[in-house]
Interface confidence: low
């Protein structure tokens, strides 16, 4: 949006579409440029030229807050925004008023204005910014602190969310979120946000407000989890009847209405969007909740948030499935409806949630709630392996350092001179409709960073704690994933985005990949064991993990994913005429299985799966695992090979072409 005077006057522009939607906890760069035809304005021969004055402000609800003012190379920042807003290119480029904002909070939504004054000239441009997403706390159905790191991530996924990052929890805390329950975050740390420190909730910060941390924890330890729900394209709605519904009846009613029971993540997003209902209803995980947006004493104790009905006064357990409540349904553009059996029928393994947003008050509850919600929950100090205040210090607040990236820094795909082997057919056979020149395999070496207990060791692969790190690229093209898309891509493939430590361990074990990829801490890196021209990066001719530092989340790269262990088996499927992608899906389903994800194939490879035949995977890619390299089978290195459509290692094969399949059950 730009507002300017006629052609010969000062003009300001923000070349971004409005509204600009950004994720909670992310950083945001808003470009703002001005053209000043007057250039130095001199008021009189004896006075110095006037410099342009830059002012950034945020306008919300008729109120304007000045974020910063800059002139003559000096920047003055509003004390409330110190360390949050900067002008990264000023004064190096005097006409560049680009603003960078760290750790976006929901409260940062609004209209941002870039205004430039020069003498009597004045011009401005505005941009609406919408911060998306909400952080919420999850608890398993049975009792508190029962989720290991893997189950914590799955708990979030099963409730239309992903595990939150430290930045997202920090942003939520700054927005007012507090919860005295330790929960996993995406970087494998355990934290909880406290505004009013009290007995049992001091953590590592004593009597100071802030996000408490236990540091990085072993993945087998159990806590609750903090999840992040980004947005939903559909709609949450209530259904009721004179008798209300049992859990099963509620599920049926939603189905009758062309919908299904909503997840907790969906209800949180609806609440964030203003949903208010003083009546408790069933959700997909068998929890009973209700969203309160307008505080009133007889409805959630004058508190806002998504309220939860518990079976026990200590905020554990869910109501009996035969008790009666409304149904909270969801209809919208999901990728796939959750099958009826998804959440099971109860018991210890059911992953579910505790979501009292502001505890500490005895709550009058709606109809059919007998136990009441308990008063403020506390951190239990009896965990066997550490005290409430462990020695691990909390890292400094997140900051962004963007190093200069030379044009040559981005690694290019190496020229593959060797002829691509063709493991997409049985030996000495060609695949109908697919000739040798049309498909190319990648020589990705994938290093195993763990081995499941009792699994066969992959020859030549080191045994390290952890799992398997692998490079992932969507079929379409190279460097196409934003930071958020990268995280989602790993999750979709049955893995999580790798941490710098995991990539470093993989590099030390011999992993090499000349492709820049996102990591968990929003840095972009790639591991090079044998430096060569297009893969020099920031390390000249020394081996090592190259890094571009922390990158803006809107930039696009590939991603490095990490898969830990396989809970099930990957098996190779074939038949004489082989399968189209669709037929492969159908065949796996007929075997009570699904097409394996890329992550599952990597995990199976790490446990010894070796197949010289490429097979369909769930994302439409074609890959094959090589444990024992042989000349006719993927070159001289172990790893998971990918068959690409184009020689530059991009493009998925035609889904109607015929290949084998890898199934998972």
């Amino acid at each position: 949006v730009e507002v300017s005077e006629p052609d010969n006057s000062l003009s300001v522009s923000i070349p971004e579409p409005s509204p600009l939607r950004v994720l909670l906890g992310s950083s945001l760069t808003i470009p703002c440029y001005f053209i000043d035809p007057m250039h130095p304005v001199t008021t009189a021969p004896s006075t110095a030229p006037l410099a342009p004055r830059i002012k950034w402000s945020r306008i919300s609800k008729e109120k304007e807050v000045v974020l910063l003012v800059a002139t003559e190379g000096r920047v003055r920042v509003n004390s409330a925004y110190q360390d949050k807003v900067t002008l990264p290119n000023y004064p190096a480029i005097p006409s560049d008023a680009t603003l960078e904002i760290q750790n976006m909070r929901s409260n940062d939504s609004g209209i941002l204005r870039c205004e430039v004054m020069h003498g009597i000239e004045d011009s401005q441009a505005t941009l609406e910014v919408v911060v998306k997403g909400i952080v919420f706390h999850y608890r398993a159905i049975s009792t508190r602190y029962t989720l290991d790191f893997d189950r914590a991530q799955r708990a979030c996924l099963q409730n239309s969310a992903i595990i939150a990052t430290p930045e997202q929890l920090q942003a939520a805390y700054e927005d007012g979120f507090h919860q005295c329950d330790a929960g996993w975050l995406a970087d494998q740390t355990v934290r909880y946000p406290i505004h009013t420190p009290r007995e049992g909730c001091y953590g590592d910060k004593d009597e100071f407000p802030g996000v408490r941390t236990y540091g990085i924890r072993d993945t087998n330890e159990t806590y609750d989890v903090y999840c992040f729900a980004e947005e939903m394209e559909g709609e949450v709605f209530y259904a009721t009847s004179p008798e209300k519904f049992t859990f099963q009846e509620a599920a049926n009613e939603c189905r009758r209405l062309g919908a299904r029971l909503a997840t907790t993540g969906q209800l949180y997003l609806a609440w964030q969007g203003g949903m208010d209902m003083c009546s408790a209803g069933w959700l997909a995980d068998r929890s009973v909740r209700y969203p309160i947006s307008k505080a009133r004493p007889n409805c959630g104790g004058n508190l806002l948030g998504v309220r939860t009905v518990y079976l026990h006064a200590n905020q554990t357990g869910y109501p009996d499935p035969s008790s009666r409540y409304d149904a909270i349904c969801y209809t919208g553009e999901d990728f796939v409806d959750i099958p009826e059996s998804f959440f099971g029928v109860g018991g210890e393994e059911d992953i579910t949630i505790q979501t009292v947003t502001w505890p500490d008050v005895e709550l009058p509850l709606p109809r059919n709630i007998t136990e009441g919600e308990a008063r403020g929950s506390v951190i239990l100090t009896a965990k066997p392996d550490f005290e409430v205040s462990p020695t691990a210090p909390e890292p400094e607040e997140p900051f962004t350092f963007v190093p200069e990236v030379r044009a040559t820094a981005f690694p290019e795909v190496e020229n593959r001179t060797e002829e691509a082997t063709r493991p997409w057919a049985f030996p000495r056979e060609s695949t109908p409709g697919l000739g040798a020149p049309t498909a190319f395999t990648s020589e990705d070496l994938v290093v195993q960073v763990t081995l499941a207990p009792g699994a066969a060791e992959v020859p030549g692969q080191p045994r390290l704690p952890g799992g398997v790190v692998f490079h992932y690229r969507p079929g379409s093209s190279r460097y196409s994933l934003t930071f958020e898309e990268a995280k989602q891509a790993c999750l979709r493939t049955g893995a999580i985005i790798a941490s710098p430590e995991q990539l470093q361990a993989a590099y030390e074990a011999g992993y090499e990949q000349c492709d820049a990829g996102w990591l968990q801490d929003q840095t972009v890196r790639y591991p090079i064991v044998s430096p060569r021209t297009p893969c020099v990066g920031d390390k000249d001719s020394s081996p090592g993990v190259r890094t571009y530092g922390v990158r803006p989340p809107s930039e696009t790269y590939d991603v490095y994913c990490y898969v830990d262990r396989l809970e099930g088996e990957v098996f190779f499927a074939t038949r004489l005429e082989q399968f189209t992608f669709w037929e492969a899906q159908e065949f796996c389903e007929s075997q009570n299985a699904t097409l394996a994800t890329t992550g599952q194939l990597y995990a199976a490879w790490s446990r010894g799966l070796d197949k010289c035949y490429a097979g369909w995977l769930a994302d439409g890619s074609l890959r094959y695992p090589i444990v024992t390299p042989r000349p006719a089978c993927g070159g001289d290195k172990p790893g998971v090979r990918t068959v690409y459509l184009y020689p530059n290692q991009t493009g998925l094969l035609d889904p109607l072409s015929r290949h084998h399949a890898f199934c998972f059950r």
Partner: nanobody
Amino acid sequence: EVQLVESGGGLVQAGGSLRLSCAASGRSFSSYAMGWFRQAPGKEREFVSIISWSGGSTVYADSVKGRFTISRDNAKNTVYLQMNSLKPEDTAIYYCAAGRLYRATPRPADFGSWGQGTQVTVSS
């Protein structure tokens, strides 16, 4: 697998309406996402609309949003495409498809069963 038969195509003037039907035979119609695609002469098959197996979720291509409506009657094993404010550029063979996947940007490979198509011609 389900077998699909489209009907309801024909010649219509610009601005007019048509309602396409797709009758499915076979088991468990209600467990399939149903989609409509179209193919104009010399062009690739393009996505028009999809409806989830429950019927509660729909997606439309930008080119037909606000003009076309997809619906289904699981009791009758039928999916419909109501086409209003038709334009000459809507001229194509319209195909009905059934699949077990549902996503916001459907692709032909998601669908395992296809009808033989019905011709829609919009004259100016």
